[in-house]
């Protein structure tokens, strides 16, 4: 009678993570008597996957009933496959022995490859805000994919970026891989509504790439421009001075009026108007009683924006020639800012 052969007909099997892998194995003879074992890997460091004699295998089932006397099908199924299951599996026939069974013949092996989807890309920006014209770095990370081949692209508002560096780790063989990319983005004043997108394409995604996004509103700081103007006289001996704070982002802003260097009022921007580009405008005014002053008055609008050093704009108010009343300025009255007379 011809000597027993162990046949593993599939050189390789490709399975998606989470699915079941079937590893086929048949013997050509019932002799010699002895159990079958499945191993992953070869040599002394191999891992026992299934033992016909004993053991508990929550994820492994046999395709046929191994207890039947004439059974020669030793195929197994491994459920809930993960990238860690990748490797070459060997079906090994043992000959009954005493005290131990003796390895008799091994199949040629079946290489199990696992396709695993990358995790949703996570995009993170710089820890601190930056102003227009500055270059900031964004990182994108995705993990757990297999095989190693993967494509990553960066976009800003739909336009592909070219200034980025990408690494896939580890460099050598692994059960699964991670990708890490850093892109450089130059900020502009119009970027409050902009988005940076990291797009990952992988064979497991069937042409439907995964995307991670970051809003530049979390990254950008647009400093305000200031303009101080003197309004027409509202009443005898009173002058209305306004400070226009324009095109700033984010909204966090504190304004202080100084009269000849002395603080007269501090207020926080509340009722702001939003521009189309996402920046904000705000106006504050000061009602100055010029009759209380003998000399010219230097009025300063000082703005502290988003915790940055204060910027200021000054206006010299001449008190030598008191202007005559020119009627009320309704536009100034309706701005909603707090009025205060200076005495």
């Amino acid at each position: 009678e011809e000597e027993l052969q162990v046949i593993q007909p599939d050189k390789s099997v490709l399975v998606a993570a989470g699915e079941t892998a079937t590893l086929r194995c048949t013997a050509t003879s019932l002799i010699p008597v002895g159990p079958i074992q499945w191993f992953r890997g070869a040599g002394p460091g191999r891992e026992l996957i299934y033992n016909q004699k004993e053991g508990h295998f929550p994820r492994v089932t046999t395709v046929s009933d191994l207890t039947k006397r004439n059974n020669m099908d030793f195929s197994i199924r491994i459920g809930n496959i993960t990238p860690a299951d990748a490797g070459t599996y060997y079906c090994v026939k043992f000959r009954k022995g005493s005290p131990d069974d003796v390895e008799f013949k091994s199949g040629a092996g079946t290489e199990l490859s696992v396709r695993a989807k990358p995790s949703a890309p996570v995009v993170s920006g710089p820890a601190a805000r930056a102003t227009p014209q500055h270059t900031v770095s964004f990182t994108c990370e995705s993990h757990g994919f297999s095989p190693r081949d993967i494509t990553l692209k960066w976009f800003k508002n739909g336009n592909e970026l070219s200034d980025f560096q990408t690494n896939v780790d580890p460099v050598g063989e692994s059960v699964s891989y991670s990708i890490h990319s850093t892109a450089k983005v130059v900020l502009t004043r119009e970027d409050v509504h902009s988005q940076v997108i990291c797009e990952v394409a992988h064979v497991t995604l069937q042409g439907d790439p995964l995307r991670g996004t970051a809003n530049l509103s979390e990254t950008i700081r647009v400093p305000p421009t200031l303009e101080v103007t003197q309004q027409p006289v509202r009443a005898e001996n009173q002058v209305n001075v306004t400070c226009q704070v324009r095109k700033f982002y984010p909204q966090r802003l504190q304004l202080t009026w100084l009269e000849n260097g002395n603080v007269s009022r501090t207020e926080t921007a509340s009722t702001v108007t939003e521009n189309k580009d996402g920046t904000y405008n705000w106006m504050s005014w000061l009602l100055v009683n010029v009759s209380a002053h003998r000399d010219d008055v230097k009025l300063t609008c000082q703005v502290e924006h988003d915790g940055q050093p204060a910027v200021s704009k000054s206006h010299d108010l001449k008190v030598s020639a008191h202007p005559k009343e020119q009627g009320s300025n309704t536009a100034a009255e309706n701005t909603g800012s707090n009025e205060r007379n200076i005495y």
């Epitope: 992953r40 002394p44 460091g45 191999r46 891992e47 026992l48 996957i49 299934y50 033992n51 004699k53 004993e54 053991g55 508990h56 295998f57 929550p58 994820r59 492994v60 491994i78 860690a84 299951d85 131990d100």
Partner: nanobody, 124 residues
Framework: QVQLQESGGGVVQAGDSLRLSCVAS????????MGWFRQAPGKEREFVAG????????YYADSMKGRFTISRDNAKNLVYLQMNSLRPEDTAVYYC?????????????????WGQGTQVTVSS
């Protein structure tokens, strides 16, 4: 060289549960098959449970089947033994063991490394 450190032992009542942990260091954990053994006073050390390096195959001594569960976390270099429905006869020092090769219940003689043990006492 592999260092093994058991924890989680203690004194419990019959019928209670206990989970033992063993942390391994000094070698790639995912290349090691792991096992638990125990030694009661005046008795030989006996096999309790074993688990292959990926965790796909597990082995239990007959008297522990259905009550004890072995598991591992390769990311944390940990192997666990969950013990339910404990009996006074489960009182022993429980040892964690690591093997470079693993042949099911042959694990006791294949174990290359041993921990110091953790005492489990089950009172009636």
């Amino acid at each position: 060289q592999v260092q093994l450190q058991e924890s989680g032992g203690g004194v419990v009542q019959a019928g209670d549960s206990l989970r033992l942990s063993c942390v391994a260091s000094g070698r790639t954990f995912s290349s090691l098959d792991m096992g638990w053994f125990r030694q009661a006073p005046g008795k030989e050390r006996e096999f309790v449970a074993g688990i292959s390096r990926s965790g796909i195959s597990q082995y239990y001594a007959d008297s522990m089947k259905g009550r004890f569960t072995i598991s591992r976390d390769n990311a944390k270099n940990l192997v666990y033994l969950q013990m339910n429905s404990l009996r006074p006869e489960d009182t022993a020092v429980y040892y964690c063991a690591a093997a470079l090769t693993f042949r099911g219940s042959d694990l006791p003689r294949d174990s290359n490394y041993w921990g110091q043990g953790t005492q489990v006492t089950v009172s009636s």
